[in-house]
Amino acid sequence: HNTTVFQGVAGQSLQVSCPYDSMKHWGRRKAWCRQLGEKGPCQRVVSTHNLWLLSFLRRWNGSTAITDDTLGGTLTITLRNLQPHDAGLYQCQSLHGSEADTLRKVLVEVLADPLDHRDAGDLWFPGESESFEDAHVEHSISRSLLEGEIPFPPTS
């Protein structure tokens, strides 16, 4: 699998899309997981509704949401209030039994807010009362990693 890069701005929302063959993956739930190290396991962040018929419902785990267009064949993940620690390698997965097929490998990059002149360590976190409806969803910038590019920094 090639790795697709999605870039988002700190403090804003990032939308990641994972296209797939809707017939091949018919009846399968989907998941979004975070790769723990280059050879490590992929830790589940959020998955679609247990009832495949209701895969279109947006399900949240913390600041991450997932929703599946099972007819169009597009899995969409939203990372709300993007933070530097959200950067890293992820996977969109199609689940069947205890197995998981990788739909897409995704590298999330977090860019500093160009309008934020404060220190990088002094990022704004929205209060609990602020709803997602008020948030501005940035169109993500995506590209595929070039051959030889390493999604993980080399470990010493």
Epitope: W52, L53, R58, R59, W60, T67
Partner: antibody, heavy 124, light 107 residues
Framework: QVQLVQSGAEVKKPGASVKVSCKAS????????MHWVRQAPGQGLEWMGI????????SYAQKFQGRVTMTRDTSTSTVYMELSSLRSEDTAVYYC?????????????????WGKGTTVTVSS | DIQMTQSPSSLSASVGDRVTITCRAS??????LNWYQQKPGKAPKLLIY???SLQSGVPSRFSGSGSGTDFTLTISSLQPEDFATYYC?????????FGGGTKVEIK
């Protein structure tokens, strides 16, 4: 107006099967899912499963797997729920209830229109 | 399965009273929580969906709040037609599950 009309009361013997119908009117039948919920005498509500009238796909609560079958007839805008191997504990009022159908990125899910219910009595 | 626990199971109140019913989920269900009203011999009626959204045609004296695991249904000023049983229901997970119900009786 939107309406779900259910079939009449049934009395069945243990081990038999029952088939309850629910006829929809006043809306586009294939645009909404249909759920079945039952209520034993003096008890609470219990969700049994869901059917997509558009394609006929179903999903049943684990408790009823192997005993329940939900089908639909798009020509008459009717859904059916068949429960087999009946026992006395299946004595209940069975409701069909409409829920939002396939859409994109919905942040809520409910059952907004209900049938009046069909009483099923299982007795020897 | 997600367990939905309602309290109290019954309460007595007078017309004009403010009534509060609580519902607790055994795990987070975000805001996938609905409230239904049921009168004897009748089908349930949707009052509140998505924890706090009022269903069309439902009087504004009904309101809902909460997210995660703890939810509340409030009737600001109880009317004679509100004496009924109220159920919460989660739709975040399979199977959908209901609370045991709260019967609101006349004092």
């Amino acid at each position: 107006q939107v309406q779900l009309v259910q079939s009449g009361a049934e009395v069945k013997k243990p081990g038999a099967s029952v088939k309850v119908s629910c006829k929809a009117s006043g809306y586009t039948f294939t645009s909404y899912y249909m759920h079945w919920v039952r209520q034993a005498p003096g008890q609470g509500l219990e969700w049994m499963g869901i059917i997509n009238p558009s394609g006929g796909s179903t999903s049943y609560a684990q408790k009823f797997q192997g005993r329940v079958t939900m089908t639909r007839d798009t020509s008459t805008s009717t859904v059916y729920m068949e429960l087999s191997s009946l026992r006395s504990e299946d004595t209940a009022v069975y409701y069909c209830a409409r829920g939002p159908g396939y859409t994109t990125a919905l942040d809520y899910y409910y059952m907004d229109v209900w049938g009046k219910g069909t009483t099923v009595t299982v007795s020897s | 399965d997600i367990q939905m626990t309602q309290s109290p199971s019954s309460l007595s109140a007078s017309v004009g009273d403010r009534v509060t019913i609580t519902c607790r989920a055994s795990q987070s269900i975000n805001s996938y929580l609905n409230w239904y009203q049921q009168k004897p011999g009748k089908a349930p009626k949707l009052l509140i969906y998505a924890a706090s959204s009022l269903q069309s045609g439902v009087p504004s004296r009904f309101s809902g709040s909460g997210s995660g695991t703890d939810f509340t249904l409030t009737i600001s000023s109880l009317q004679p037609e509100d004496f009924a049983t109220y159920y919460c229901q989660q739709s975040d997970d399979d199977p959908f599950t209901f609370g045991g119900g709260t019967k609101v009786e006349i004092k």
